[in-house]
């Protein structure tokens, strides 16, 4: 990507300091979606342009970032900054030429997926790994897969094991790992949400 | 501004194709799914399947399974539903749905297509 | 898959009174249920999420609580735009599915 960073950059560098000290206060109270955390005001408030970009990306990634980046403009009334830098990013969403379906593997980057976000945490919590697997079988998993997985002797190693195939699972996928964890350890995934 | 703009009503005979589309603007097509929900006349909503764009998989209700195909064109932004033969049955409204966020597969679909009115009749 | 049944199927009440819609799920969603309202010639609008949570924009006179199996939308004081068709769904599994509807109308 990269593309969309720039592009908030731009967006950033084009304030007035009046402005960008507004951009801020706003980024303090703006909805965020669910699972992504506030910048803290301290650090918020002292940030030039350069800086409040690098925390924007680190913090909502690059498509998000430049999609609040946006909503913020459009709320100060800079419709038409909002527009550019919306512009600026689709271009460099890796679309394919008009008329023709890029295939799957030349995708742009897609967002990243609860799984992926708490990988971490995933491996290391994850109790009723055999029910995941028994939920898993035979429509994400192969019958090699689950029994390289049950192979394993603790449950962070098998949850490590699981998360050794998901570079190859599409976003479907994912979501039925999801739904198996929600259905197996709901708890877990409340407290992931609040991280 | 999120948008989702379907397009227009359909009048068609049993056993002809249908292909319906659903054109997005207003954030980055490849972030979110994009879902299709059903609506007989008079009658309640029932969601049918959803396809991912950045990697173009779907997610089929098993009862639309194998009945309809969903689909993305990502140079255009736009989500397809489409029927091969279709059946006096298939007569009903369709909205295509975006949901609030799609980072946890929490699916609230906070914004809707104005519907497209698919009529089956010989 | 999970089944939704709302009640009643029809409320009818007058303006400034207050709406109870309740929603039961077969089995567990967790809090993982939505609400929307729906009127003739509509697409259907986004309400409540996740059992609580008020969608922007949505007035404060909506407001929604349960957790499990069984659910309620409330609305506080009525207005005269608020009669419609009222649908739950559920987001804790797969296929997603919806109540079969409360149709909210004027006594």
């Known amino acids: 990507m990269g593309r969309a960073r720039d592009a908030i950059l731009d967006a950033l560098e084009n304030l007035t300091a009046e402005e960008l000290k507004k951009f801020k206060l706003k980024l303090l109270s703006v909805p965020l979606r669910e699972g992504y955390g506030r910048i803290p005001r301290g650090a918020l408030l002292s940030m030039d342009a350069l800086d409040l970009t690098d925390k924007l990306v680190s913090f909502y990634l690059e498509t998000y970032g430049a999609e609040l980046t946006a909503n913020v403009l459009r709320d100060m009334g800079l419709q038409e900054m909002a527009g550019q830098l919306q512009a600026a990013t689709h271009q460099g969403s890796g679309a394919a030429p008009a008329g023709i379906q890029a295939p799957p593997q030349s995708a742009a980057k897609p967002g990243l997926h609860f799984i992926d976000q708490h990988r971490a945490a995933l491996i290391a919590r994850v109790t009723n790994v055999e029910w995941l697997l028994d939920a898993l079988y035979g429509k994400v998993l192969t019958d090699e897969q689950y029994q390289a997985v049950r192979a394993e002797p603790t449950n962070p190693s098998k949850m490590r094991k699981l998360f050794s195939f998901t570079p190859a699972w599409n976003w479907t996928c994912k979501d039925l790992l999801l739904q198996a964890l929600r259905e197996s350890q709901s708890y877990l995934v409340e407290d992931l949400e609040r991280s | 501004e999120v948008q989702l703009v379907q397009s227009g009503a359909e009048v068609k005979k049993p056993g002809e194709s249908l292909k319906i589309s659903c054109k997005i603007s207003g954030y980055s097509f490849t972030d979110q799914t994009i879902h299709w929900v059903h609506q007989m006349p008079g009658k309640g909503l029932e969601w049918m399947g959803y396809?991912?764009?950045?990697?173009?998989?779907?997610m089929y209700n098993e009862k639309f399974q194998g009945q309809v195909t969903i689909s993305a064109d990502k140079s255009i932004s736009t989500a397809y539903l489409q029927w091969s033969s279709l059946k006096a049955s298939d007569t009903a409204m369709y909205y295509c749905?975006?949901?609030?966020?799609?980072?946890?597969?929490?699916?609230?679909?906070?914004?809707w297509g104005q519907g497209t009115l698919v009529t089956v009749s010989s | 898959e999970i089944v939704l049944t709302q009640s009643p199927a029809t409320l009818s009440l007058s303006p400034g009174e207050r709406a109870t819609l309740s929603c039961h799920a077969s089995?567990?969603?967790?809090?993982?249920l939505s609400w929307y309202q729906q009127k003739p010639g509509q697409a259907p609008r986004l309400l409540i999420y996740?059992?609580?949570n008020l969608h922007t924009g949505i007035p404060a006179r909506f407001s929604g609580s349960g957790s499990g199996t069984d659910f309620t939308l409330t609305i506080s004081s009525l207005e005269p735009e608020d009669f419609a068709v009222y649908y739950c769904q559920q987001g804790q599994s797969y296929p997603l599915t919806f109540g079969q509807g409360t149709k909210l109308e004027i006594k």
């Open positions: 996740k059992s609580s």
């Open positions: 089995q567990n969603i967790n809090v993982y």
């Open positions: 749905a975006r949901p609030l966020y799609s980072y946890a597969s929490y699916y609230w679909f906070a914004y």
């Open positions: 396809i991912y764009p950045g990697d173009g998989s779907a």
